[in-house]
Each structure stands twice: as structure tokens, then as C-alpha cells.
């Protein structure tokens, strides 16, 4: 099918960075300034994204790829292709409608984004609290009395931090 199409459609020969110009007998013309085509055989070039205002340019637009944006310091990207900027908070806080608020007792957040998560419940694993939790850090679970035999491991590190409650980037 591809071979048949290329025989019939001269536009299929136009590479990325060009478009098939119907006004010029389907000649492959370069994309105009501030536009791009990321695949071959395009009949038009797409307008480059402009990273304006709080959206900063992370990667300039080229004839074959769109610009990429990120957010001004104090905010971070959210959504596909950094379609939104969301406020940073301090460690030990989470973002709410009312702005950044401290984590409630018994919860923590060790990042500038995401939500406060409950401290690990050491007793569920039959362990004791070795280091108390804070707003910024999870508890560290230590051995249960039965684990204090020679050669036993003395500390269980906390589970790796996850970041629930936010759209993927």
C-alpha cells in the first residue's frame, strides 16, 4: 500500500520540516518561520507553540519539532506538554484551594509538590518507631524486640516516596 501511495501521491516524498505546497504543483516547500512539521508527507506545517509570560522556553521550535515550555520558578509544570503551571509549596506542606498549607499531624510531604501522606505505621509490620516522623519526613521503623538477635538488620528504610493526587506530566 505504501509503495502504491508513493507512486500516486508526490506529497509522501516531502520530509519532516517541509510541507507539500498545493499552490506550487505539490513541490516540497520548507516550513515558514515559526512553524514545523514533525513527520513527512504533511500538507501544512503546524504553528510553533509560544512560551509566553510565565511559560518559559525550554526548547526552541525548529522546522521539525515544536517548542517545549516550562514554568517560571515558584511554579512547576502540569499536564501533557506542560499545558499548565502549578504553584510550588515548601516541604511539609501541600497545595489546596487556599494556597500552601502545613501537613496535618501524622502526615508528611518531602517534596515541593504533591500531597501530604500518612506516616508509615510501623506496628503493622510488627516494628517500632526508631525515628519520629515530621511534616517533612516519614517515620523510620526500627526492629521489633524479637528482631534484636545478633546479625539481624536494625533499620527498615521508609517506603519510596510516591506522589499521588496529581496529573502525570
Amino acid at each position: 500500500f505504501e509503495r502504491t501511495r508513493s507512486l500516486q501521491d508526490p506529497c509522501s516524498n516531502c520530509p519532516a520540516g517541509t510541507f507539500c505546497d498545493n499552490n506550487r504543483n505539490q513541490i516540497c516547500s520548507p516550513c515558514p518561520p515559526n512553524s514545523f512539521s514533525s513527520a513527512g508527507g504533511q500538507r501544512t506545517c503546524d504553528i510553533c507553540r509560544q512560551c509566553k509570560g510565565v511559560f518559559r522556553t525550554r526548547k526552541e521550535c525548529s522546522s521539525t519539532s515544536n517548542a517545549e515550555c516550562d514554568c517560571t520558578p515558584g511554579f512547576h509544570c502540569l499536564g501533557a506538554g506542560c499545558s499548565m503551571c502549578e504553584q510550588d509549596c515548601k516541604q511539609g506542606q501541600e497545595l489546596t484551594k487556599k494556597g500552601c498549607k502545613d501537613c496535618c499531624f501524622g502526615t508528611f510531604n518531602d517534596q515541593k509538590r504533591g500531597i501530604c501522606r500518612p506516616w508509615t505505621n510501623c506496628s503493622l509490620d510488627g516494628k517500632s518507631v526508631l525515628v519520629n516522623g515530621t511534616k517533612e519526613r516519614d517515620v523510620v521503623c526500627g526492629p521489633s524486640p524479637a528482631d534484636l538477635s545478633p546479625g539481624a538488620s536494625s533499620v527498615t528504610p521508609p517506603a519510596p516516596a510516591r506522589e499521588p493526587g496529581h496529573s502525570p506530566q
Epitope: V54, L78, G79, S83, M84, C85, E86, Q87, L95, T96, K97, G165, H166, S167
Partner: nanobody, 123 residues
């Protein structure tokens, strides 16, 4: 196209007042949370205030509570920020920003931003 245009900035003396406006076009203004965000010289962005679609909920950063008032007029597609008792710390570029789809539910991201209006508080 979708656009936000701020106005009303300027030079004001400490203790003075200003009212910022933001004119929205190209989208259904009454369907979105709206925000004011500012950037002081040499600093990062700071969220200032937000307002729900119908104006029934309004929230402020602690440093402006009792001095700034956010409001909106959905009939005029306009957002406002009344700023009283201004101090030098309020000197900044003020941006109007639209809360993205799902704002307040699973995120607080802002997807459309104005070009900003400059407020300078100085004697």
C-alpha cells in the same frame, strides 16, 4: 483566541490603593476558577488569590489577607483585584490566570495567563 489582558497597574505611594482588572475573551469565563499571581523583582512567582466560578469561594495568600479583595463580573467577562494599604513588598508584576480544567478537584494548575501589569509601591 483565548486571551487575558490585565490593566490598572501603576505607581502608588505606600498606604495607597489600586484596582487591577483582567478582561477575558475567547472562552466561557463563568466556567473557570480565576487567579491573581504576582512576581516581585528578582523573585519567583507567588500565588495571591483565587475565586470560584460563581464567586462563592475566595481565597488569599496570608500576606494580603484583609488588604486585597478579589472579585469577578461574569456578565462583563472580567476579574478584579482591589488592593488597599499597599506596601513596598507588594511591588510586582501581577498576572491574571485561568484555572485549568479540573482546577480545585485534582490539581491547581493554571493554563492561560495574561501578559501582566506592573504595580510599583514607592514614595
Amino acid at each position: 483566541q483565548v486571551q487575558l489582558v490585565e490593566s490598572g497597574g501603576g505607581l502608588v505611594q505606600p498606604g495607597g490603593s489600586l484596582r487591577l482588572s483582567c478582561a477575558a475573551s475567547g472562552f466561557t469565563f463563568s466556567s473557570y476558577w480565576m487567579n491573581w499571581v504576582r512576581q516581585a523583582p528578582g523573585k519567583g512567582l507567588e500565588w495571591v488569590a483565587n475565586i470560584k466560578q460563581d464567586g462563592s469561594e475566595k481565597y488569599y495568600v496570608d500576606s494580603v489577607k484583609g488588604r486585597f479583595t478579589i472579585s469577578r463580573d461574569n456578565a462583563k467577562n472580567s476579574l478584579y483585584l482591589q488592593m488597599n494599604s499597599l506596601t513596598a513588598e507588594d511591588t510586582a508584576v501581577y498576572y491574571c490566570a485561568r484555572g485549568g480544567e479540573g482546577y480545585g478537584d485534582d490539581h491547581y494548575g493554571m493554563d492561560v495567563w495574561g501578559q501582566g501589569t506592573t504595580v510599583t509601591v514607592s514614595s
